[in-house]
């Protein structure tokens, strides 16, 4: 398990919401992203591929969320100070081989100017 | 260690046969599952496959509309409902697990004899 | 439906000698870094099993006398020393889209 800090801008606020960005190597085929808050899964999103290359994608802990080729977009809303805290994208990579997890996070500030406009988007 | 048994019989031509494959060894729910057939004294032919949760399901050409692919996770077996039986169809099928990038994992077989 | 082919039909090669297997796609089986080709081997009475994936990358537990190489539509299968225990017939097979198909076999035999 690989563990660090995201080197890339993690939370993107919108209008009292927040979409918290879980990057990817574009190499990897498979995998299953899950969105941790503190020590608990929020959100998750596996992608698989059968034997004629047929794209899967499950979520057993639902929330909105968005896929593109390097990553999953988890979005929180109606944002209040309860929100702040660590949040981590945990992966676990299948495909291509090893099988690997790797851990990376940062720490959600919630300001007042965040929380004025309550609307979903 | 991953295990699959198969289990299959004897059928008329134009009747129905169920095979189920009890899996065990692994987490059923999270793979991708198939069946491929071997004719006797010749190759594999890949039949039909269906997703972690039954979502998605896929059939050769051959087999398309007569036979119908399912699982229970409950119950870790894949199942293979095959209708319209016709002697061509007579074949060990092998039930497998799709390992993320190949068949990793085969059952013994399990031989469908099609005969009047 | 692509169609694979495989040659020569059999082969017989001697204790330690090369064997070399080819296997041609009727389409391109390259996507992004990925050529999605495996070879299976079946030993007489047994199912198959997975010996190398994505052309070139082996299996588990496979002695490295295997090895896969080729990109495109064009592969090749060899065993660099060949055993007793090597003797079976090898398949090729795509999952480039759906159906996934097999190659015919290639039956591998001591000389």
């Known amino acids: 398990e690989i563990n660090g800090s995201a080197n890339y801008e993690m939370f993107i606020f919108h209008n009292g919401g927040v979409q918290i960005l879980c990057k990817y190597p574009d190499i990897v085929q498979q995998f299953k992203m899950q969105l941790l808050k503190g020590g608990q899964i929020l959100c998750d999103l596996t992608k698989t591929k059968g034997s004629g290359n047929t794209v899967s994608i499950k979520s057993l802990k639902f929330c909105h969320s968005q896929l593109s080729n390097n990553s999953v977009s988890f979005f929180l809303y109606n944002l209040d100070h309860s929100h702040a805290n660590y949040y981590f994208c945990n992966l676990s990579i299948f495909d291509p081989p090893p099988f690997k997890v790797t851990l990376t996070g940062g720490y959600l500030h919630i300001y007042e100017s965040q929380l004025c406009c309550q609307l979903k988007f | 260690e991953v295990q699959l048994v198969e289990s299959g019989g004897l059928v008329q031509p134009g009747g129905s046969l169920r095979l189920s494959c009890a899996a065990s060894g692994f987490t059923f729910s999270d793979y991708w599952m198939d069946w491929v057939r071997q004719a006797p004294g010749k190759g594999l032919v890949w039949v039909s496959n269906?997703?972690?949760?039954?979502?998605?399901?896929e059939y050769s050409p051959f087999v398309k509309g007569r036979f119908t692919i399912s699982r229970d996770n409950a119950k870790n077996t894949l199942y293979l409902q095959m209708n319209s039986l016709r002697a061509e169809d007579t074949a060990v099928y092998y039930c497998?697990?799709?390992?993320?990038?190949?068949?990793?994992?085969w059952g013994q077989g399990t031989l469908v004899t099609v005969s009047s | 439906d692509i169609v694979m082919t495989q040659s020569p039909d059999s082969l017989a090669v001697s204790l330690g000698e090369r064997a070399t297997i080819n296997c041609k796609s009727s389409q391109s089986l390259l996507s992004g870094s990925f050529n999605y080709l495996t070879w299976y081997q079946q030993k007489p009475g047994q199912p198959p099993k997975l010996l190398i994936f994505?052309?070139?990358t082996r299996h588990t537990g496979v002695p490295d006398r295997f090895s896969g190489s080729g990109s495109g539509t064009d592969f090749t299968l060899t065993i660099s020393s060949l055993q007793a225990e090597d003797v079976a017939v090898y398949y090729c097979h795509h999952h480039y889209n759906a159906p996934p198909t097999f190659g015919p076999g290639t039956k591998v035999d001591i000389k």
């Open positions: 269906i997703d972690e949760d039954g979502s998605i399901t």
């Open positions: 497998t697990r799709w390992g993320r990038f190949g068949f990793d994992s």
């Open positions: 994505y052309a070139s």
